[in-house]
């Protein structure tokens, strides 16, 4: 059980001096492990017993072992349920204290009742201030039972609960009808999950026989020892004024544990400290009685005397709870109260004994929880003791529980029980996670959940190429750190698995599920260079490049061309998906823009080195379109075009370009330059007779401008087939070749 104690200081004359302290004796700092364990929580639980709101209570932490609740201003602040929570993880435990008002109408004869499953529990509320009204019993705040006020027996109202089951556990109260709830008698009923002397999931295991009023925990079979006692079976008394599982804590104040109520983890509940009794734990035990609440009787033999804190103090030559055992009787020495082994290991367990006559190898035996008896394989005989060594067969989970070492000689016998915990090595429930990959390395997160028992002492990462029969490579890693697997093969699938270990021999768990992680392609290493480029219009650029010649196949899937427009801070990327390509046409560029251009080889998602950059200036966009283009047939081979100059020109026109195309024809259009920009008409000659033509035109300043509207016109008559159209402007008669 978790070493957690809730202390209530019951000096009730002054509520402001009242305090509750929760003390943890867990290893190291007392909250699960060390200072880093989960903090102790101490609070009033108002879910069942609600009291009028008052100033907030003050919580003070004293180091990591202890937390104290103060700031009670009036007696009603004290009434109700308080809880302390401590321990880490699965061991997180709640300890509960129920406080009754000393001035209440009804007072409990006994606040905490711990009973076994199937028992009959009897709660007894003593009349302190009589009222001639019915008494209402409640369970966890809900109505349960009513007693007529005449039904009091000997000044007490009794509630009998036959055949109790674990769900019956909780806070019970007895209240006079129409009286303040603060005047109720509050009880706590704890129902163990098993019948007397049994524990475990099916209640199949036998309790160790807790001494001195210790209570067997129904889940783990451990004895929860009363304050002031220690040991696997609570067999050992602490020095006066001490408590905690190892007697490591000391009661505050000069009067020791007087006036303190101690509450421990269920199924113990609460009691006075050893040597004290009474509703306020201020009365010393009567002669012949000892222990928590003075519930134990000494019955000392052979001249032993009764100490109210520890029980019988034996004279020389005698030992035992009642001084009933002679020192001649053999005695088990220094047996650990708890041992831990990993599943399927074959540990060696030692058991030492002394006595007169001296124990020999055959007189010491080891008994497992299932009753199997093991005989020692060897014994080491020393002057003061014999140590028997037992080789334990392969451990299974059912071996968890209480083992017993027993020594028998003609002088008598002794036995010592100890707990064996069989732990399951941890097994990852998930595969490690791939974070990033490169051609020769994988970055992996090995942080995985696991089944079985912690703590995790070692994390191993195993990996090898997929479908390989070669040995696994293994590295030991920190489970919360990203791990880089180095020197891998490119473009290769690797099977990666995690293996966890816990402390102790045989603590290595099975390997976790595999996951496939694939390394990236090899990086392309060749650096292209730009051979040349030329502008094919204000928004079109043709680029060509080369690669160095190297032996072997080309490592690459294609090329990436990048155009950086530094003015606008924009990048254009063009993917050329053939590794054989050495030229590309880039379209849709911004006219008049200064671009930085480079090209690089890519393979999978990896880019090779970029070519040295080139700087390219695209010509600016041209002027607006000529207006009102009109076509008029002059003969069977001539058509005259007329137009108006474009508006809002950015500069002087250098020429016009006319596009001629046979309507419905499949051939390429023909472009004819008009080199006299001042003209507004031209004659296109050499056309075919009776043929329909399409015309459009555009102006050029530094770059070609927008096209005009398209016009249609047919040549006249049925003349001879011409050699092809030519142009003649109004001011010049010479033709222009195509």
């Amino acid at each position: 059980a978790v070493d957690l104690t809730l202390l209530a200081n019951l000096r009730l004359t002054d509520p402001q001096r009242f305090f509750l302290t929760c003390v943890s004796g867990e290893a190291g700092a007392g909250r699960g492990s060390d200072a880093w364990g989960p903090p102790l929580l101490l609070e009033k639980d108002d879910r069942i017993v609600r009291t009028p709101p008052g100033p907030p209570l003050r919580l003070a932490r004293n180091g990591s072992h202890q937390v104290t609740l103060r700031g009670f201003s009036k007696p009603s602040d004290l009434v109700g349920v308080f809880s302390c929570v401590g321990g880490a993880g699965a061991r997180r435990t709640r300890v509960i204290y129920v406080h009754n008002s000393p001035g209440a109408h009804l007072l409990p004869d006994k606040v905490t009742h711990t009973v076994n499953k199937g028992d009959t529990a009897v709660l007894s509320a003593r009349v302190h201030k009589e009222k001639q009204t019915d008494v209402i019993w409640k369970s966890n705040g809900s109505y349960f039972y009513t007693l007529d006020w005449h039904e009091a027996q000997d000044g007490r109202f009794l509630l009998q609960l036959p055949n109790v089951q674990p769900p019956s556990s909780g806070i019970y109260s007895a209240t006079y009808l129409e009286a303040s709830p603060l005047g109720s008698a509050f009880f706590r009923l704890i129902v163990r999950g098993c019948g007397a002397g049994r524990w475990g999931p099916g209640c199949t295991k036998e309790c160790p026989g807790c001494l001195h009023g210790g209570v067997c925990h129904d889940h783990d079979g451990e004895c929860v020892c009363p304050p002031g006692f220690t040991g696997t079976r609570c067999e050992q008394a602490c020095r006066e004024g001490r408590f905690g599982q190892s007697c490591q804590e000391q009661c505050p104040g000069i009067s020791g544990c007087r006036g303190l109520t101690f509450c421990l983890p269920d199924p113990y509940g609460c009691s006075c400290g050893s040597g004290w009794r009474g509703s306020q734990c201020q009365e010393a035990c009567a002669p012949g009685h000892f222990g928590a609440d003075c519930r134990l009787q000494c019955q000392c033999q052979n001249g032993g005397t009764c100490d109210r804190f520890s029980g019988c103090v034996c004279p020389s030559g005698w030992h035992g709870v009642h001084c009933e055992k002679s020192d001649r009787i053999p005695q088990i020495l220094n047996m650990a109260s708890e041992l831990e082994f990993n599943l399927e290991t074959m540990p060696r367990i030692n058991c030492a004994a002394a006595g007169n006559p001296f124990p020999v190898r055959g007189s010491i035996e080891l008994r497992k929880p299932d009753g199997t008896v093991l005989l020692s394989t060897k014994a080491i005989v020393e002057p003061e003791k014999t140590t028997a060594e037992f080789e334990v067969p392969r451990l299974v989970l059912a071996d968890s529980g209480f083992w017993e070492c027993r020594v028998s000689t003609s002088g008598g016998q002794d036995s010592r029980r100890f707990k064996v915990n069989v732990k399951v090595p941890p097994v990852p429930l998930a595969a490690p996670r791939l974070l990033t990959k490169q051609s020769r390395q994988l970055v992996v997160s090995p942080l995985v959940s696991f089944s079985g028992d912690g703590p995790i002492s070692t994390v191993r990462l195993h990996y090898r190429p997929q479908d390989s029969t070669m040995d696994w490579s293994t590295i030991v890693v920190d489970p919360s750190e990203n791990v880089t697997l180095m020197n891998l093969r490119p473009k290769t699938g690797y099977s990666v698995r995690v293996q966890l270990s816990r402390p102790g021999e045989g603590g290595e768990g099975a390997w976790g599920p595999p996951t496939l992680m694939t390394t990236d392609c090899p990086e392309p290493l060749l650096q292209p260079w730009l051979e040349g480029w030329h502008v094919e219009g204000t928004d079109r650029l043709r680029v060509s490049w080369s690669l160095p010649l190297v032996p072997g196949p080309l490592v690459g899937d294609g090329f990436l061309l990048r155009l950086w427009d530094g003015t606008r801070g924009q990048e254009r990327r063009e993917n050329v998906s053939s590794p054989q390509a050495r030229t590309a046409l880039l379209t849709g560029l911004t006219p008049g823009t200064h671009y930085q251009l480079d090209v690089q080889l890519y393979h999978c998602t990896l880019l090779g080195p970029a070519s040295p950059p080139a700087h390219v200036l695209l010509p600016p966009s041209g002027p607006p379109a000529p207006r009102h283009l009109h076509a008029q047939a002059l003969s069977d081979s001539e058509i005259q075009l007329t137009w108006k100059h474009p508006e809002a020109l950015p500069g002087p026109i250098s020429k016009y370009v006319v596009e001629v195309q046979v309507a419905g024809g499949a051939g390429d259009p023909l472009w004819i330059d008009v080199d006299r920009p001042e003209e507004t008409s031209t004659i296109i000659r050499g056309l075919n007779a009776s043929t329909r033509y399409l015309f459009r035109m555009r102006a050029s300043i530094q770059g070609l401008g927008d096209w005009s509207n398209t016009v249609e016109e047919s040549t006249l008559g049925n003349g001879l087939q011409a050699e092809g159209p030519v142009q003649e402007s109004r001011a010049a008669e010479e033709g222009l070749d195509q």
Epitope: A29, W36, P39, G63, S64
Partner: antibody, heavy 119, light 107 residues
Framework: EVQLLESGGGLVQPGGSLRLSCAAS????????MNWVRQAPGKGLEWVSG????????YYADSVKGRFTISRDNSKNTLYLQMNSLRAEDTATYYC????????????WGQGTMVTVSS | DIQMTQSPATLSLSPGERATLSCRAS??????LAWYQQKPGQAPRLLIY???NRATGIPARFSGSGSGTDFTLTISSLEPEDFAVYYC?????????FGGGTKVEIK
């Protein structure tokens, strides 16, 4: 690379405020308890504050309680220390330190950032 | 608070010699004690945890011992790079506390 990088130090007047940051990289930041440890010039180490991986539990040294606030942003892999009501005795190099995953000590430290409180 | 006291404050030794550093706690800290090494201008480095376990990558010449209140860090044969300041630290109780440090200098 597994590392911690502090920033935000500098010169501040007594009574002033400063916010230190610690950027973590190369490990699962959200799985670790993180701490601030300081070292006055020519003096020894003093633990200042610690915060659990989820931020649910926080601890302070008595010397800074009520003045300093530790916090973390796991989505940004960053630890913070908000320092208010600064005093001359807070002058120190402030280290961000990671608690080993088994809790046994501080296994990763930053290079530190200097805080000087002076008028 | 748990006070951690280190002695001596300074230890003057030559390379190759054995160094023994002591750390005492004002109350029991079980085995929850760590040792750190700090060189000038650098952050501390974890050497030993839980009183006697070497941290990852720490050479075997460093060893720790003790439990409860008395602890020792031993450097079996000093190397030139071992001259530094060494701190002990407890994690048994809040607040976590460091010792005042022992400076190991070249004689």
């Amino acid at each position: 690379e597994v590392q911690l990088l502090e920033s935000g130090g500098g010169l501040v007047q007594p009574g002033g405020s400063l916010r230190l940051s610690c950027a973590a990289s190369g490990f699962t930041f959200s799985a670790y308890v993180m701490n601030w440890v300081r070292q006055a010039p020519g003096k020894g180490l003093e633990w200042v504050s610690g915060i659990y991986s989820s931020g649910g539990y926080i601890y302070y040294a008595d010397s800074v309680k009520g003045r300093f606030t530790i916090s973390r942003d796991n989505s940004k892999n960053t630890l913070y220390l908000q320092m208010n009501s600064l005093r001359a005795e807070d002058t120190a190099t402030y280290y961000c330190a990671r608690r080993h995953f088994n809790g046994v000590g501080f296994d990763l430290w930053g290079q530190g950032t200097m805080v000087t409180v002076s008028s | 608070d748990i006070q951690m006291t280190q002695s001596p404050a300074t230890l003057s030794l030559s390379p190759g010699e054995r160094a023994t550093l002591s750390c005492r706690a004002s109350q029991s800290v079980s085995s929850y004690l760590a040792w750190y090494q700090q060189k000038p201008g650098q952050a501390p480095r974890l050497l030993i945890y839980d009183a006697s376990n070497r941290a990852t990558g720490i050479p075997a010449r460093f060893s720790g011992s003790g439990s409860g209140t008395d602890f020792t860090l031993t450097i079996s044969s000093l190397e030139p790079e071992d001259f530094a300041v060494y701190y002990c630290q407890q994690r048994s109780n809040w607040p976590l506390t460091f010792g005042g440090g022992t400076k190991v200098e070249i004689k």
